[in-house]
């Protein structure tokens, strides 16, 4: 009686159970009554990560430098390559298939959260009493200089982009 189901790591073909190929190998020919399943190792830059009956191995993921990607972990015959963003770049999507430079916060805005490999810079407007006069992916809004603590007075009010200008107090004779 021919089998209707096979054991783990086997597959049914021509009414008989053949061994699957192990991870890292592809199927060349099915087994017969007289011969075992024939498997061959995947080539360079190819992989198969499961017991299988695939006749072609999968290509390793391509970490395209023109998309800002680099190899984080080199693939093997049993594992895929893992890509990550180059320094100073972050992913454009959850699956991280391309990367772009971190955004800078413009003058008048400061960095609320510094970018990571998976998230962009988060900027916030500088509130009253704070300023930023640079375009930066790292700098937070800075507080206006306190003229009083220097025994000076405000000569020019600060804005979200400029610091206050302090000057000497007018001395009344």
């Amino acid at each position: 009686e021919p089998p209707t189901a096979c054991r783990e790591k086997q597959y049914l073909i021509n009414s008989q159970c053949c061994s699957l190929c192990q991870p890292g190998q592809k199927l060349v020919s099915d087994c017969t009554e007289f011969t075992e399943t024939e498997c061959l190792p995947c080539g360079e830059s190819e992989f198969l990560d499961t017991w299988n009956r695939e006749t072609r191995c999968h290509q390793h993921k391509y970490c395209d430098p023109n998309l800002g990607l680099r190899v984080q972990q080199k693939g093997t015959s049993e594992t895929d390559t893992i890509c990550t963003c180059e320094e100073g770049l972050h992913c454009t999507s959850e699956s991280c298939e391309s990367c772009v430079p971190h955004r800078s916060c413009l003058p008048g805005f400061g960095v609320k959260q510094i970018a990571t490999g998976v998230s962009d810079t988060i900027c916030e407007p500088c509130p009253v009493g704070f300023f930023s006069n640079v375009s930066s992916a790292f700098e937070k809004c800075r507080p206006w200089t306190s003229c009083e603590t220097k025994d000076l007075v405000v000569q020019q009010a600060g804005t979200n982009k400029t610091d206050v200008v302090c000057g000497p107090q007018d001395r009344q004779r």
Epitope: S45, K61, Y62, D64, P65, N66, L67, T92, S93, E97, S98, V100, P101, R103
Partner: antibody, heavy 117, light 107 residues
Framework: EVQLVQSGAEVKKPGASVKVSCKAS????????IEWVRQAPGQGLEWMGN????????KYNEKFKGRVTLTADKSTSTAYMELSRLRSEDTAVYYC??????????WGQGTTVTVSS | DIQMTQSPSSLSASVGDRVTISCRAS??????LNWYQQKPGKVPKLLIY???RLRSGVPSRFSGSGSGTDYTLTISSLQPEDVATYYC?????????FGQGTKLEIK
């Protein structure tokens, strides 16, 4: 399925401008850059520039700088290539292509631009 | 710009023949070399990327090799449906540049 659908054929006079559109579907438009390539009749392929819809980053081939403008409308997942000050040598098929998981992995069907007086 | 020179510019071969197309870059492109197939009246299609990686769905009779400045596309056994123009393209340095193409015909 990733698809790039381009606008129809155009006939223009020398000195005019042309704007070719490329509507993307089947993937998240802002994930990958769009490349623009042209092919003059019976000739090879020539890269014009690329545009990343995520951050509007644009790179141009020096040969076309000042004449070509690449833009996109994220709300409609459409990329645009505008070429100004047209001359007869600009008669060509203009292609958009996605630089996706692989280089130039999906192409539009091409837009024929004829420049003739 | 990096110049890409293909040879031959055209060739005629018989079904079943082994066909090779060469591509030379004017400077080292570190394997950043792609091959495209353009059938008459059709859109170019990526065949091979990063010198030797076969795009999924492309018949295994196509292969690529090379390094430095010299690269080769090989068709191990030519089929009638392989009639097309083949282009190499360097992906190493902007502006991306293509070879002038090799037109392949069946004898």
């Amino acid at each position: 399925e990733v698809q790039l659908v381009q606008s129809g054929a155009e006939v223009k006079k020398p000195g005019a401008s042309v704007k070719v559109s490329c509507k993307a579907s089947g993937y998240t438009f802002t994930t990958f850059p769009i490349e623009w390539v042209r092919q003059a009749p019976g000739q090879g392929l020539e890269w014009m520039g690329n545009f990343h819809p995520y951050n509007d980053d644009t790179k141009y081939n020096e040969k076309f700088k000042g004449r070509v403008t690449l833009t996109a409308d994220k709300s409609t997942s459409t990329a645009y290539m505008e070429l100004s000050r047209l001359r007869s040598e600009d008669t060509a098929v203009y292609y958009c292509a996605r630089r996706g998981k692989l280089p130039f992995d999906s192409w539009g069907q091409g837009t024929t631009v004829t420049v003739s007086s | 710009d990096i110049q890409m020179t293909q040879s031959p510019s055209s060739l005629s071969a018989s079904v079943g023949d082994r066909v090779t197309i060469s591509c030379r870059a004017s400077q080292d492109i570190s394997n950043y070399l792609n091959w495209y197939q353009q059938k008459p009246g059709k859109v170019p299609k990526l065949l091979i990327y990063f010198t030797s990686r076969l795009r999924s769905g492309v018949p295994s009779r196509f292969s690529g090799s090379g390094s430095g400045t010299d690269y080769t596309l090989t068709i191990s056994s030519l089929q009638p449906e392989d009639v097309a123009t083949y282009y190499c393209q360097q992906d190493r340095k902007l502006p991306w540049t293509f070879g002038q193409g090799t037109k392949l015909e069946i004898k």
